[in-house]
């Protein structure tokens, strides 16, 4: 039975030209995290593999930095970066857990972080 939950930074906003940290945390499970994939729609941003380290997609190499931890830092933000981001935790033996973050990139300098909140996990087995 999958007992884990993913906590994310939730709905967040940031200023155009600035940077933002995307962060997820898996809790309430003893499953081993083998890999974390970061995606925007169907585009891969990065993978953090427990054995092999980080792979940043070539499309994002110049403005995505690994970390902190299993999180991801997006730099040089544009309004086109507005949208949904997903952290996909591949675990053993549980399977996959997925967290969602919505990022809004604002033209103004009034960008504020949304409250940290917990979302129900959804998952599938490979």
């Amino acid at each position: 039975m999958m007992t884990g939950t993913i906590e994310t930074t939730g709905n967040i906003s940031a200023e155009k030209g600035g940077s933002i940290i995307l962060q997820c945390h898996l809790s309430s499970t003893t499953a081993q995290v083998t890999q974390v994939n970061w995606e925007q729609q169907d585009q891969l941003l990065a993978i953090c593999n427990a054995d092999l380290g980080w792979h940043i997609s070539p499309s994002f190499k110049d403005r995505v930095a690994p970390g902190p931890g299993l999180g991801l830092t997006l730099q040089s933000l544009t309004v086109n970066d507005t949208g949904e981001y997903f952290c996909i935790y591949h675990t053993y033996p549980d399977g996959t857990y997925t967290g969602r973050i919505f990022l809004e990139v604002l033209e103004s300098s009034v960008a504020e972080h949304g409250a940290r909140f917990q979302i129900p996990h959804h998952h599938h087995h490979h």
Partner: antibody
Framework: EVQLQESGPGLVKPSETLSLTCAVS????????WNWIRQPPGKKLEYIGY???????YYNPSLKSRVTISRDTSKNQFSLKLSSVTAADTAVYYC??????????????WGQGTTVTVSS | DIVMTQSPDSLAVSLGERATINCRAS??????IAWYQQKPGQSPKLLIY??SYRYTGVPRFSGSGSGTDFTLTISSLQAEDVAVYYC?????????FGGGTKVEIK
């Protein structure tokens, strides 16, 4: 130029252990990750597993109970052992190199492959 | 495991014409796709990684797609392109390959 060269017996008896070695030249095994892939006659490529630059291993769950991948950095080579073989393990076995940081799971330097037949 | 299905199984194309090979994943794999060329009696050679990025020194070949559907295109088929082409996903372990598409000259 990086070269990978597989070696080992071409014929293995059923129930015995298949042992192959991949010699790496022109590059140090202390970075990147090092893979084994096989291709049974007329079938698709099957991923066996890897050993990382730090010595950590991953094995395909379908073979996990029978596979061991190890390395000898002093000789710049890594090895595959597959126990309790059957005719279904007859295949061309390839070793290959991957650079996870730049190419993810895409493998870009391959050995020429060695054919292993399991038969009594 | 993620199942990769290629189509067609074989393809005959005239020299200088375009060849298109399709690959479908059993679940979304984002852009974590590689394409390989395997000529008779040789080992596979990497052509494309991250779905659309050409590996060093690879001409004529292009890749596209994301999610579950991917395409490898040879813009103008040459005699030396006769080979079997494989897609591979590395979204999750174990990495898995398609069944291959054989490209021949018509």
């Amino acid at each position: 130029e990086v070269q990978l060269q597989e070696s080992g017996p071409g014929l293995v008896k059923p129930s015995e252990t298949l042992s192959l070695t991949c010699a790496v030249s022109g590059y140090s095994m202390t970075s990147d990750y090092w893979n084994w892939i096989r291709q049974p006659p007329g079938k698709k490529l099957e991923y066996i597993g890897y050993i990382s630059y730090s010595g950590r291993t991953y094995y395909n769950p379908s073979l996990k109970s029978r596979v061991t991948i190890s390395r000898d950095t002093s000789k710049n080579q890594f090895s595959l052992k597959l126990s309790s073989v059957t005719a279904a393990d007859t295949a061309v076995y390839y070793c290959a190199r991957g650079d996870y940081s730049n190419y993810g799971g895409a493998m870009y330097d391959w050995g020429q492959g060695t054919t292993v037949t399991v038969s009594s | 495991d993620i199942v990769m299905t290629q189509s067609p199984d074989s393809l005959a194309v005239s020299l200088g014409e375009r060849a298109t090979i399709n690959c479908r994943a059993s679940q979304g794999v984002s852009t974590t796709i590689a394409w390989y060329q395997q000529k008779p009696g040789q080992s596979p050679k990497l052509l494309i990684y991250s779905a659309s990025y050409r590996y060093t020194g690879v001409p004529r070949f292009s890749g596209s797609g994301s999610g579950t559907d991917f395409t490898l295109t040879i813009s103008s088929l040459q005699a030396e392109d006769v080979a079997v082409y494989y897609c591979q996903q590395y979204y999750s372990s174990p990495f898995t390959f398609g069944g291959g598409t054989k490209v021949e000259i018509k």
